[in-house]
Every structure is written in structure tokens, then in C-alpha cells.
């Protein structure tokens, strides 16, 4: 007898009531920037402190009648979803509310900025345990709001925000578009994206994951024991803020990068019906629904990786797209994707002392995406080894020659406009897993990493007949770090990682003759860290 | 409102020498940029967040804000500093006419200026 949303985020082998401890999230403070709230509601009484911060615009309309219960509605509900006694995710979390939205649910970028600054100053004056900031609001893209979020995140604060309810690309909104913020879309009881009137949840590469956001039962400001059902990406974000509080309470030392990777790792995978999203956004939108980890104990032994898509390069001939990992993450591989198939590959390059993934558009191409595989690899020392185009017919190859370095990813980049249409495919010599092989007219880049106990292996899956998609997955206990296509298949649109599966996409088979070039091989590099596993066992 | 006018007169006198000097001329080759919300109905013209370069100290932020007020007053414009940011981003929030944007973008330490805009509960 628990609400569907709490059941959904609870690991299947636990009964939700038993699983969620009464003090879950008790070491964490969650800041809520929203409307005013009814702090004496039974769900949140004694656990939400209303700060004296208020920065809101005047309500619109001369005849607007301020009714306390309406003014408090949005914020009270969200506070209840995060930490409510009965319908909350993190029932032990304490909260602080800042009023940045007026009685009509409207605020300003400047008011939100001042609110974020207030939180930072509070943190400096009185440092507490882990902080989560919930931003259940959205406005148009704002450079300054994103910058403020970035600064706060770099000060060790976890920011969680609503993706937005505009049935649009979340990258067009702030703070949803800020890379440092955990951006949450909304799904319903059927794990479908939430429709809200003619609109619905936002989507796209700026969304980190989805969470329950339709018919969410929570505290109603109508009365001190009332409940009401509300829907939206705010409700979804509140679930993730609650999950984050639970995780941080169990592991207070988690960094933002570690927390984000765990949220992704423990999410339900591939349950959302992607047909709801516009076709061009499907590949960019994560098919992840947030869930609590199956245990409140750490999962530090796992090698966590996530896929980060760049913005679209645009169609100009020399256009490039860049995908970046978070400061605490390692770029272990780089791939590219183009819907037209016209691209000039990708390369890993240093930028500001950190590796980035850059994809190159080709003449006549509609643009490319760069896809970075970003991983948590403590004490890693990674470098890129490059081999220039070879003249030999056997193609270009590069391997990790340094002692103790293992291959985590392969990239190839070429200057010629349409590689491979008139050249025979290059066959990869067997038994040489620690090297990247590419077309003789391409430069090949190997990502080589040294980290304690890191081991990697190459896994391939080739299909002789042309297919729109070829996949290869890493087995249990191994994590996908690299994803690429074997050279010589000219109709390949690109390669990218989806969770632990490497996906190689090809042009529509109907337009490709079933020649020898129809063969498509997906190459996955799967890694694991014995060092992390041992460290975890020693702790236990 | 009248009190503010009085303040501006004082500021103009106090800052005339600083403003006319070259002590804090903007760095060469760096142009501050202006940003505004792409969604027109959400724009809030008349209020601007002036973001200063990363290492700018609070005292410099306050000085830059005062300088803007003084230069605006000389041109017959009323401005109001609503908030001075420090702790997260250096800068200030100012209520002023859009006519002053060009002037504001040329101030020392300015990285970019963003017009305020609305955010909404989701």
C-alpha cells in the first residue's frame, strides 16, 4: 500500500516499506528553491526549515488574490516528495526552503542567482554535511544561471533540476542545460515520458535521467494532513534529490561525478518508449529511470562509465563538435555519429589540460556529434597515442606500448571527404587486442590508460549482411569503455555506447547494396578494475 | 526616488577623476558580450546581470557598479544597483535603461551582461 512512484524507485528485491529506513538521508541537507511552503504540514513538519530568503517578482494581474494555500502549493508538494514522512523518498533528510517563485510559480534568473549565492554563503559560514540543491524551475537558456550552478557544483554541492515541461530539447532551458547539474525528465507509472496537456517532459542530451513525475502523491498545502497528486519534471527532480540524499547519507564522501555515475548505474535501463521523443532526439536522450541502489553500502569497486553527447556541430564543412567529461572523470574513448553518414571521424585532444572528444563534419554532411565515454578511474594516467595515415595497404594501426598501459578506446579521423567508398575494407589481424586498426588514409588514436588493477579486453560482433544496427555488449562485471566500428564499412553512420552496449549504426540497408562492404563489425572495449574490487572487499 | 537623484550627484563628483583616468581601462582584445533570453515573452528588459571576470574582488565589483552609475548619471540616466554578487560569481544586478548597455559593456572587468528573464515552476 505505497504510492506507485515510491515502489518504482525501490529495487525489485526489496519491499519498499522495509527498504527505506526511517532516517534515510539524515546526514544530508536539501535546499529547495521554490515557492513558499506550508512548513507545519504533517509530512514535513519539523524537517523543513524556512529560511528568511525571499526574492520574487510581483504577481501578474491587478486582480490577483494571494491565497496562502495556493502560494505554498508547489513547494509544499516537492518538500513532501523529497522528505515527507509518508510519501517522501528520503524520509530522514532535513530541508531548507528559499522562496524564489511567487504565488503564480514565477521567478527570475536574478532572484535564483541571489538564492544560489545565499546557499554558498550559508555553506561557508556554517559548513555542514553533504548539500543537495533542488531547482524545480526552468527558464530560457541562461549563461549566467548555468555559470552560477557550475560554481556551486565545483564547491561540492549537488544540484538537481527539472528538465522542463515544454516537450522540447532541455538544452534550450536553464538550469537544465548546465552540465554540472543533474537534470531530470519525467516518466509515468507505465515508464512512458510524461505528457502535460499539449506539452510534456523535456528530453535530449542535457537530460541525465528520468524519474517518476506523473500523478505523484505528496503534501498538499490545502490542509496540514492533506495530500494531492501533482505532475511535472519538478516532481521527477524531487525524486532524484531524495535518492541523492539517501546515497550521500550512506556515502557522505561521494563527489558529484561519483554520485551522477551511481544514479545512472542504478537506474532502470531501456524501459522508456522512445517513440514519444522526436526522432532526432531519441539517440541523444538517456533511456534511464532513477532508482535507489540495491543497498545503502557503497559500490566503489565498480568501474562506472557514462556516455556524454556533444551539441550538434552544425552543417558547415569544417564544423566540429566537442564532448567533454566532468572534471573528476577520465575520457576513456571517443566516437562520432552523423545521421547523413558524412563525417571525418573523431579524435581525442588536449584542451585546458584535459582530454576532450572532437568529431569532424565532412563536406555535404548535415553535421556530427562527438560522443565521449566518461569514466571514474581513480589514480588513472591516460594518454592518447596517434598513428598518422599509413601508406601500406594493411591500414593504419596503433597500440599502447607503455608498460602497464591498456587500451580503453579507439578513434579514427581522416582528412579525405568520403573514406572507404572506393577502397577495400581493412581486415584486422587477430590476436592483437591491444591495438587500434584503421583505414590507411585515416589517423588512428588509441586511448591508453594505466590505473591500479585495470584490465581490458576487446569484444567484437560482426554481421556479414548489411544491417541498420550492430551491437556488442560487455558481460557482467565488465564495463564498456570503448565503442567503435571496424574500418572499411563506408556506410557506417557512427558508433556510440548505450549503457554497457556498443552500438554501430549504418545507413538504411535499402540504400546500401549487399556488397562485401555490407559487413559491419562493432568493436567494444570492456574493462574492469581488480584494484577497486579488492579495495571494496578489504573494506568489508 | 528623490534620494536616489541626490546620491547620483555625489557619485558623479566622487568618481569623475577615477572615471576619466586610465587606471582601469578594459583589457585590449577582450570584448564583453550581451546575452538575452531567446524566448521573448520571458524577457525582463530593464534589469541586467553584469558579470565580471572570474578573479574580480568584491571591492572592484562595487567600484565598477558605482562607475556605471556615475557614467549613466552624466548621460542623464537613472540607474539602481539592486544587488552586488560575490561568493559565486563576481558582478552586480542593475536596473537601468537598455540604452546604457553599450556603455556597460565597456566597463573594466566586465565579462558579459545578461538581461534578466523569468523562470517558472515545473
Amino acid at each position: 500500500s505505497i504510492p506507485w512512484n515510491l515502489e518504482r524507485i525501490t529495487p525489485p528485491r526489496y519491499r519498499a516499506d522495509e527498504y527505506q529506513p526511517p532516517d534515510g538521508g539524515s546526514l544530508v541537507e536539501v535546499y529547495l528553491l521554490d515557492t513558499s511552503i506550508q512548513s507545519d504540514h504533517r509530512e514535513i513538519e519539523g524537517r523543513v526549515m524556512v529560511t528568511d530568503f525571499e526574492n520574487v517578482p510581483e504577481e501578474d494581474g491587478t486582480r490577483f488574490h494571494r491565497q496562502a494555500s495556493k502560494c505554498d502549493s508547489h513547494g509544499t508538494h516537492l518538500a513532501g516528495v523529497v522528505s515527507g514522512r509518508d510519501a517522501g523518498v528520503a524520509k530522514g533528510a532535513s530541508m531548507r526552503s528559499l522562496r524564489v517563485l511567487n504565488c503564480q510559480g514565477k521567478g527570475t534568473v536574478s532572484g535564483t542567482l541571489i538564492g544560489l549565492e545565499f546557499i554558498r554563503k550559508s555553506q561557508l559560514v556554517q559548513p555542514v554535511g553533504p548539500l543537495v540543491v533542488l531547482l524545480p524551475l526552468a527558464g530560457g537558456y541562461s549563461r549566467v544561471l548555468n555559470a552560477a550552478c557550475q560554481r556551486l557544483a565545483r564547491a561540492g554541492v549537488v544540484l538537481v533540476t527539472a528538465a522542463g515541461n515544454f516537450r522540447d530539447d532541455a538544452c534550450l532551458y536553464s538550469p537544465a542545460s548546465a552540465p554540472e547539474v543533474i537534470t531530470v525528465g519525467a516518466t509515468n507509472a507505465q515508464d512512458q515520458p510524461v505528457t502535460l496537456g499539449t506539452l510534456g517532459t523535456n528530453f535530449g542530451r542535457c537530460v541525465d535521467l528520468f524519474a517518476p513525475g506523473e500523478d505523484i502523491i505528496g503534501a498538499s498545502s490545502d490542509c496540514s494532513t492533506c495530500f494531492v497528486s501533482q505532475s511535472g519534471t519538478s516532481q521527477a527532480a524531487a525524486h532524484v534529490a531524495g535518492i541523492a540524499a539517501m546515497m550521500l547519507s550512506a556515502e557522505p564522501e561521494l563527489t558529484l561525478a561519483e554520485l551522477r555515475q551511481r544514479l545512472i548505474h542504478f537506474s532502470a535501463k531501456d524501459v522508456i518508449n522512445e517513440a514519444w521523443f522526436p526522432e532526432d532526439q531519441r539517440v541523444l536522450t538517456p533511456n534511464l529511470v532513477a532508482a535507489l541502489p540495491p543497498s545503502t553500502h557503497g559500490a566503489g569497486w565498480q568501474l562506472f562509465c557514462r556516455t556524454v553527447w556533444s551539441a550538434h556541430s552544425g552543417p558547415t564543412r569544417m564544423a566540429t563538435a566537442v564532448a567533454r567529461c566532468a572534471p573528476d572523470e577520465e575520457l576513456l574513448s571517443c566516437s562520432s555519429f552523423s545521421r547523413s553518414g558524412k563525417r571525418r571521424g573523431e579524435r581525442m585532444e588536449a584542451q585546458g589540460g584535459k582530454l576532450v572528444c572532437r568529431a569532424h563534419n565532412a563536406f555535404g554532411g548535415e553535421g556530427v556529434y562527438a560522443i565521449a565515454r566518461c569514466c571514474l578511474l581513480p589514480q588513472a594516467n591516460c594518454s592518447v597515442h596517434t598513428a598518422p595515415p599509413a601508406e601500406a595497404s594493411m591500414g593504419t594501426r596503433v597500440h599502447c606500448h607503455q608498460q602497464g598501459h591498456v587500451l580503453t578506446g579507439c578513434s579514427s579521423h581522416w582528412e579525405v571527404e568520403d573514406l572507404g567508398t572506393h577502397k577495400p575494407p581493412v581486415l584486422r589481424p587477430r590476436g592483437q587486442p591491444n591495438q587500434c586498426v584503421g583505414h590507411r588514409e585515416a589517423s588512428i588514436h588509441a586511448s591508453c590508460c594505466h590505473a591500479p588493477g585495470l584490465e581490458c579486453k576487446v569484444k567484437e560482433h560482426g554481421i556479414p549482411a548489411p544491417q541498420e544496427q550492430v551491437t556488442v555488449a560487455c558481460e557482467e562485471g565488465w564495463t564498456l569503455t570503448g565503442c567503435s566500428a571496424l574500418p572499411g564499412t563506408s556506410h557506417v553512420l557512427g558508433a556510440y555506447a548505450v549503457d554497457n552496449t556498443c552500438v554501430v549504426r549504418s545507413r538504411d540497408v535499402s540504400t546500401t547494396g549487399s556488397t562485401s562492404e555490407g559487413a559491419v563489425t562493432a568493436v567494444a572495449i570492456c574493462c574492469r578494475s581488480r584494484h577497486l574490487a579488492q579495495a571494496s572487499q578489504e573494506l568489508q | 526616488q528623490e534620494d536616489e537623484d541626490g546620491d547620483y550627484e555625489e557619485l558623479v563628483l566622487a568618481l569623475r577623476s577615477e572615471e576619466d583616468g586610465l587606471a582601469e581601462a578594459p583589457e585590449h582584445g577582450t570584448t564583453a558580450t550581451f546575452h538575452r533570453c531567446a524566448k521573448d515573452p520571458w524577457r525582463l528588459p530593464g534589469t541586467y546581470v553584469v558579470v565580471l571576470k572570474e578573479e574580480t574582488h568584491l571591492s572592484q565589483s562595487e567600484r565598477t557598479a558605482r562607475r556605471l552609475q556615475a557614467q549613466a548619471a552624466r548621460r542623464g540616466y537613472l540607474t539602481k544597483i539592486l544587488h552586488v554578487f560575490h561568493g559565486l560569481l563576481p558582478g552586480f544586478l542593475v536596473k537601468m535603461s537598455g540604452d546604457l548597455l553599450e556603455l556597460a559593456l565597456k566597463l573594466p572587468h566586465v565579462d558579459y551582461i545578461e538581461e534578466d528573464s523569468s523562470v517558472f515552476a515545473q
Epitope: I2, P3, D17, D40, R85, I217, D222, C226, F227 | -
Partner: antibody, heavy 126, light 106 residues
Framework: QLQLQESGPGLVKPSETLSLTCTVS??????????WTWIRQPPGKGLEWIGS???????YYNPSLKSRVTISVDTSKNQFSLKLSSVTAADTAVYYC??????????????????WGQGTLVTVSS | EIVLTQSPATLSLSPGERATLSCRAS??????LAWYQQKPGQAPRLLIY???NRATGIPARFSGSGSGTDFTLTISSLEPEDFAVYYC????????FGGGTKVEIK
């Protein structure tokens, strides 16, 4: 059919602590659908809500009594208890336990006090 | 705290007559008001909840109306078993009860 039964001493000395237990039968305390509540009625007077608890042990008290009240739950025994410290003659009353639908699961019924125990009279006297 | 004032304190009527009981709140309680019936030596029993909804098993002669600050409990035709004390209760803000109205046989 759910039934509630109050038990505890009928006489308590002033300044001591009043302790009562409510045993729930015909249903489980273990449910997020309900709060378990104490209400009292001084002789010939009206009703006063004392406080409520859910199966997780999360409490909610009448502000006027908060400093003296402790409500606890024992799900293994299907019981919840009331402790009222520093009692005076003004605390003499019939003490009732009742169930209240929390409102989290709307299908569980109206969000009011129903059913009630039959009540137990506690007299504070030396 | 929201104070509920019930009137009259006592209502003397004969069986078959119509009883009208009033409950006034010191501030709006919206429709978050219930009515209980208490007979001597018994616990209160829920009659009406959310101002106008009859609880399970309550006869149709009992009806509730009102919202905001003024509420009425009506017993259309008094039966012998209806002579009791009636309390109103709000849950808009915490829980408070009215002082009660005693319906006695005339």
C-alpha cells in the same frame, strides 16, 4: 474488522508519567496508509487531539502538549503507546486511541479518525 | 490554532423532528470538517467527513453542508438512537474539535 483497545493504569500521581498502550487487532499497524492517534476527553468536556504516529515511528504532536508527549510504536506487537510526563489534575480524562487514514493511499478511506477504541479513564490524583 | 464554536450547546427536540446543528470556525477550514456522534460511555463515531460526505454505514437522514467558516449538520427526522452529543472537527490546521452540541429528548 479493525479494533483498537486501550490499556494502562487508571490512576497516576501528579508529576509522574502517564503510560498507555493501544493494541490493534483485525489489521496491521504496518501500513503507510494510516496514522495511529491518541485523543483525550476530560470529564464532561470536549475532545482534544494529543498526537499521532505512523508505523515507521514518525510522530506529530499537538503543539500545546508537545513538550510532555512521547508516542512510540511496536510493529512486532501491533501496538502503539502514549507517555505523558509531569501530569497534573488537568490531565484527568478518558484517553482514546484511533486510526486516521494518512491520505497517502486515497483508496484507504477518508482522512479522519475512524475507528476509535472504547476509551480508558485515567485519573490524576495523589 | 483554529477554534471551532458549536451552537446551540443543547438542542431539545422530539423524535421525528428536524435537527440543525451549527459549527463555526475562527478562520477558513475550506471543506476539511467532520462531524462525530458520541453516546454516553461510548467512543465518538465518524458521521460526516469533508463537510458533506457520509461515512460508511451512516443513514441518509444525516447530511452535512457548508464550507469556509460556517458548517451545518442536519438530521432530517430524529430517531430515538440519534439523541447524543455531536462534535465537529477540522483538519485544515492540525486537529481541533468543537465544544459539542447535546441533542436531547424534549
Amino acid at each position: 474488522q479493525l479494533q483498537l483497545q486501550e490499556s494502562g493504569p487508571g490512576l497516576v500521581k501528579p508529576s509522574e508519567t502517564l503510560s498507555l498502550t493501544c493494541t490493534v487487532s483485525g489489521g496491521s499497524i504496518w501500513s503507510s496508509s494510516y496514522y495511529w492517534t491518541w485523543i483525550r476527553q476530560p470529564p464532561g468536556k470536549g475532545l482534544e487531539w494529543i498526537g499521532s504516529i505512523n508505523y515507521r515511528g514518525s510522530t506529530y504532536y499537538n503543539p500545546s502538549l508537545k513538550s510532555r508527549v512521547t508516542i512510540s510504536v511496536d510493529t512486532s506487537k501491533n501496538q502503539f503507546s502514549l507517555k505523558l510526563s509531569s501530569v497534573t489534575a488537568a490531565d484527568t480524562a478518558v484517553y482514546y486511541c484511533a486510526r486516521e487514514n494518512s491520505g497517502v493511499v486515497p483508496a484507504a478511506g477518508p482522512n479522519w479518525f475512524d475507528p476509535w477504541g472504547q476509551g480508558t479513564l485515567v485519573t490524576v490524583s495523589s | 490554532e483554529i477554534v471551532l464554536t458549536q451552537s446551540p450547546a443543547t438542542l431539545s427536540l422530539s423524535p421525528g423532528e428536524r435537527a440543525t446543528l451549527s459549527c463555526r470556525a475562527s478562520q477558513s477550514v475550506s471543506s476539511y470538517l467532520a462531524w462525530y456522534q458520541q453516546k454516553p460511555g461510548q467512543a465518538p463515531r465518524l458521521l460526516i467527513y469533508d463537510a458533506s460526505n457520509r461515512a460508511t454505514g451512516i443513514p441518509a437522514r444525516f447530511s452535512g453542508s457548508g464550507s469556509g467558516t460556517d458548517f451545518t449538520l442536519t438530521i432530517s427526522s430524529l430517531e430515538p438512537e440519534d439523541f447524543a452529543v455531536y462534535y465537529c472537527q477540522q483538519r485544515r490546521n492540525w486537529f481541533t474539535f468543537g465544544g459539542g452540541t447535546k441533542v436531547e429528548i424534549k
